[in-house]
Every structure is written in C-alpha cells, then in structure tokens.
C-alpha cells in the first residue's frame, strides 16, 4: 500500500493505476481527468481591492471607484457590520476589531463617512465634514504576537515561542521550504518551492514546533501561485497554501500580520529571518533546529550594483542581509518570512533567491509582500 501510494496514483471509473509522475503534467491520463485536478493552480493578479490598511495606526482607506481616489474612513456612524464588510473585501472571515483614532496633523487623504452597498464599502452620498474628527483603525485578525521576543545577536537557535507562525513545508516527508501562517486556513510561501512537484497530494505542512521532525503534518487542499513566466523565473515568487482543515491557534501556532500597503522600509531597518535551511553554502545539511538571525534592509540601488545583482532586483523584490555578509538565508529557508516588528510582527518579505549564501555584495533577495497584497486578498476572496 505504501509503495503503491508512493509511486502510483489510482484513477477512478474504471479503477486503474497510473505512475505518480504523470500527475499534474498537463495531460489527462485518467479518463475523468482527476490526475490534473489537485495540482498547483495559477491565479491572475486581478483588480485593485477597494479597501486597504495604512501603517498610520492601521487606519482604513477606501477607493472611490467613480473617481479613482483613495480616502480615509471617518469614524462617524461606523459599525461592526461595516468593519466585517471591509475585512471580507480583503478576504478575511474572522471577527474584526475597530476603534476610533484621532485625525492626525499629517492627514493627507480626504476623510469621508462610509456606507455599504452590495457587500462593498462606499462613500456616503452626502458626505460633509467628519464630525467625530476620528478615523477608523481596523484589525481584521489578531496577528503578529508571540510569547517571546528574540534577542538581537548574529545567528542563534530559535524557539517556536518567538516565531509561532513559522511552518515547515514538506514533500514526501522531506522538508523543502519554510512558510508563514497568515490565518487559520492559509500559509504564505514561495512559488519556486513547487516547481519540481506540482501535485498537491504529497505536500504537507508542519506547524507548532522548532524541531524539524517532531510535529504532526497537516493536509493541504490547494496551492496557488501567480502564473509562472519562464522568461522571468525569479518574478512573482509567492504562493498561498490552503489547508484542508483550519488551524487551532495556540501559544505555538499563531498567524503573522501582512504588511500595510504603505510599509516602506528604509535601508538599515532591522529585520529578522528564520529557517531550517543549510547552515553552509553548497553543503552541510538542513538544520534540525530552527535558526534565527537579525539582518537589515539593503538599499535596492546597492543591491543592483555591478558587483551585485546588476539590475535583476525588481521593485517587487527587496534585499536584506548585513553589509559585511555572513548572515543570510540559504537553501531550505526558501518561502520563509522576512520579518519586521512594529507593534506586531509583519511578514514583509518571502525568502526567494540569491547568489550563494552570505556573500557581502550579494545579500538575500526577498519577494516584497506589500507588492502582492491585492493578489493575496483576491485569492482569499475567491476562496471565501
């Protein structure tokens, strides 16, 4: 049975086996095509989601689809139902929390009262001044809180208490990539993790431990990427894994927050990386223990210099490392989070690519998560 499952796939009507390597190869090998059903699926980038949250106290902004302008939501007459609508528009199904925050002196956008129309937020038709003088601060999910704060040193062993959103993504029980829990159903990782194996069946997620082999595996229902372009293989290196059953959150299993749309991190901003990846370039083995390291944002201009990546780092990517080199993510860390701490922890990057590991002029390159918020929200909405 184990051997059969490992090497063969059972087609129904009529029942017969096909070699597992024929799964997800683009050919219908089973009469009903079920060999092509549970495969990595692509999902287009899609339209702008008409709500977003700003780094200014997680304040809600809404797009006026008639004029193409963003405006800030006034707290006047804002209700729980409107908060739920806003979060549903971003694909969240959890119960949101909201509060009033004072309009600051630097308020840039128009502040307008909100109403709802066919499950979408709209500006109220005769919206005059914002009488409360307050904006809506909205949180769609409690996220980014851990039981333990890491200490700032080079590379050290990590505890799951510090990083309860970190998961191991495994194929045939072998660790392939890292990933981050975003909500009870969804894990964020890198698309390149699935280049070799595009069938969903054998992929599993392990959450809740800092040791590689010691935690139960979770079944995966779907793996979603943006269309792969072989001309630009490093682009759009982002994937979402939908779990078959929702996670139960605990001290060691918790979600990390997505970044704000306007989360612009300046060079030298401190960040954290974690993973079970190789501890030495071109060799060694996966670390059994989760490792953590502090790094910093490296300026994109520096990262694209002639002695570095020569223009390969696009505006949807970011670089992080330490100027002198030696601290970096490596093979096996792919898909894991690059993290920034403000009030909560945010996943600002996904471990993606780099030349070697830890070289001074070639730091790690990460998928910039804020560039893909619309895509994430559109995927979630489609799966609600």
């Amino acid at each position: 049975k184990v051997i059969l499952d490992k090497y063969y796939f059972l087609c129904g009507q009529p029942l017969h086996f096909i070699p597992r390597k024929q799964l997800c190869d683009g050919e219908l090998d089973c009469p009903l095509g079920e060999d092509e059903e549970h495969c990595v699926k692509s999902f287009p980038e899609g339209p702008a989601v008409a709500v977003r949250l700003s780094k200014d106290r997680s304040t809600l902004q809404v797009l006026d689809s008639a004029t193409g302008n963003w405006f800030s939501a006034c707290f006047d007459n804002f209700t729980e139902a409107l908060a739920e609508t806003a979060c549903r528009q971003m694909g969240y199904s959890s119960k949101p929390t909201f509060r009033a925050v004072e309009i600051g002196p630097d308020q840039d956008l128009d502040v307008v009262e909100i109403t709802e129309n066919s499950q979408e937020l709209r500006m109220r038709n005769s919206s005059g001044p914002c009488l409360s003088g307050s904006l809506v601060s909205l949180h769609c999910l409690a996220c980014g809180k851990s039981l333990k704060t890491p200490r700032v040193v080079g590379v050290e062993e990590a505890s799951v208490d510090s990083w309860p959103w970190q998961v191991s993504i495994q194929y045939d029980k072998q660790h392939v990539c890292g990933g981050s829990i975003l909500d009870p159903h969804w894990v964020l990782t890198a698309a390149h993790c699935f280049r070799k194996h595009t069938d969903v069946f054998n992929w599993k997620v392990r959450a809740g431990s800092d040791k590689l082999g010691s935690f139960p595996s979770l079944a995966v229902a779907k793996i979603i990427i943006i269309e792969f372009n072989p001309m630009y293989p490093k682009d759009n290196d982002i994937a979402l894994m939908k779990l078959q059953f929702p996670l139960t959150f605990s001290g060691t299993v918790r979600p990390i927050c997505l970044p704000f749309f306007d989360e612009e991190l300046t060079p030298a901003t401190p960040l954290w990386i974690i993973g079970w990846g190789f501890t030495k370039q071109n060799g060694g083995k996966m670390s059994d223990i989760l490792l953590q390291a502090s790094v910093q944002v490296i300026d994109s201009t520096r990262c694209n210099a002639d002695d570095a990546y020569q223009g390969e780092v696009t505006e949807k990517m970011m670089c992080a490392g330490i100027p002198e080199g030696g601290v970096d993510t490596c093979q096996g860390d792919s898909g894991g989070p690059l993290m920034y701490q403000s009030d909560q922890w945010h996943v600002v990057g996904i471990v993606s690519w780099g030349y070697g590991c830890g070289g001074p002029s070639t730091p790690g390159v990460y998928t910039k998560v804020s560039a893909y918020l619309n895509w994430i929200y559109n995927v979630w909405k489609a799966e609600l």
Epitope: A48, A66, T67, G68, N69, W70, D108, M123
Partner: antibody
Framework: EVQLLESGGGLVQPGGSLRLSCAAS????????MHWVRQAPGKGLEWVAV????????YYADSVKGRFTISRDNSKNTLYLQMNSLRAEDTAVYYC???????????WGQGTLVTVSS | DIQMTQSPSSLSASVGDRVTITCRAS??????LAWYQQKPGKAPKLLIY???SLQSGVPSRFSGSGSGTDFTLTIRSLQPEDFATYYC?????????FGQGTRLEIK
C-alpha cells in the same frame, strides 16, 4: 503644503506635438487621481482628462480623445499630458489638478499656456 | 454627458448685497457638486464641495444648497474681493463638466 507645478507649454504649429508635465509635492501622489483642465482665452473651464491613482484607468473629454494621452510616474511624483495633432482650438491655459473624492478640485497648479498657431 | 447650465451669465451688484447664482444639471448628480471662484490670471479656487459643505478657509458668507439637479450658490453680503467669475462643476460621473460661468461685476 500641496504644490502642483506645470511646465512644457509654448507655441506650436497646428498638427504639432507638445508634452506637458506637472510636478507634485506635499501629498501622497500615488493615492490620488490626477486631472488636466484647460481654459481657452476668455472662455470657461473645460475638463480634459483624468488618470487613476495607479495609472490603471484613464478617461478623456471627447474633444481630445485619440489625440491626447495622460500618464503618470508615481516614483517621480509627476503627471504628464502628451498632446499630438494639435489644433488651434487647443490653445488654452492647461492646469493640472489633484483629484478629490467627488468633491471638486481643491488643489490646482498655476497653469501653463499652450498656443497653437501657424 | 451631463450638461451644467448656470444662470445668470453675468450680474452686477454692490458691496453688501446678497447674491444668488443657480446651476442646473441635465441629470441627477446627487450632491456631487462644487462651486469655484476665479479671478483673472489665477487658477480657480474651491468654495463649496458636496453641494453645501464650505471648503476650509472660505468665508462663511458663502453658502451652497440643493441636490439632484438644482443647486444654488449664495453670497450673503458681498465684499470687494468677491467680484470674480463663478463656476459650478459636477463630479458625479466622467466626463467631469463645468457650468459656463457667471461673471459677477461691481454695479
């Protein structure tokens, strides 16, 4: 303080081309739609074109459709109007204006004069 | 396209007078109507937005009213600096359209 500064106006022959620029500062340019509005000498205001905050949608007045192209570079905080096949009736002061949420135009540039004449 | 018709096209008044300018839309524009003041050689200045909301920094002698298709701009007690051209504008739908203007002159 919000500032909009147009440039690129001048004298051009009928059938010629001109590119206007509008440099924006003092606000989050990438969150606002931007407009061009013109005013012929001694006449009223005429809306010309709008571009959405991210450049994803553009709309034009019938009088300029197919001849004028609005564009923006959010990394440079700059709005553009490429004007081709210019006619005498395009002679006007061209203003850029920051889009507001259906609340009219609170912020305008000082205007740049385009004269189409042989 | 929505046509905006202002009346009168021009009017003469004295300092201290109460003046009313009307604007009619060819179809319903809700309350998405703005009023501007323009002086020669200058860019227009926003006075009223959303039909009746006073733009900050604009004197309270200016007021707006109306919704749907009929709108009014009222200047309660004319001051010397109020002599200018006034425009209404709808932002309910694209293309955005302006009224032809009302020139307010000193009597």
């Amino acid at each position: 303080e919000v500032q909009l500064l147009e440039s690129g106006g001048g004298l051009v022959q009928p059938g010629g081309s001109l590119r206007l620029s509008c440099a924006a500062s003092g606000f989050t340019f990438s969150s606002y739609a931007m407009h061009w509005v013109r005013q012929a000498p001694g006449k009223g205001l005429e809306w010309v074109a709008v571009i959405w905050y991210d450049g994803s949608s553009k709309y034009y007045a019938d009088s300029v459709k197919g001849r004028f192209t609005i564009s923006r570079d959010n990394s440079k905080n700059t709005l553009y109007l490429q004007m081709n096949s210019l006619r005498a009736e395009d002679t006007a002061v061209y203003y850029c204006a920051r889009g507001e949420v259906r609340r009219g135009f609170q912020h305008w540039g000082q205007g740049t004069l385009v004269t189409v004449s042989s | 396209d929505i046509q905006m018709t202002q009346s009168p096209s021009s009017l003469s008044a004295s300092v201290g007078d109460r003046v009313t300018i009307t604007c009619r839309a060819s179809q319903n524009v809700g309350s998405w109507l703005a009023w501007y003041q323009q002086k020669p050689g200058k860019a227009p200045k926003l006075l009223i937005y959303a039909a009746s909301s006073l733009q900050s920094g604009v004197p309270s002698r200016f007021s707006g009213s109306g919704s749907g298709t009929d709108f009014t701009l009222t200047i309660r007690s004319l001051q010397p600096e109020d002599f200018a051209t006034y425009y209404c504008q709808q932002s309910y739908s694209t293309p955005i359209t302006f009224g032809q203007g009302t020139r307010l002159e000193i009597k």
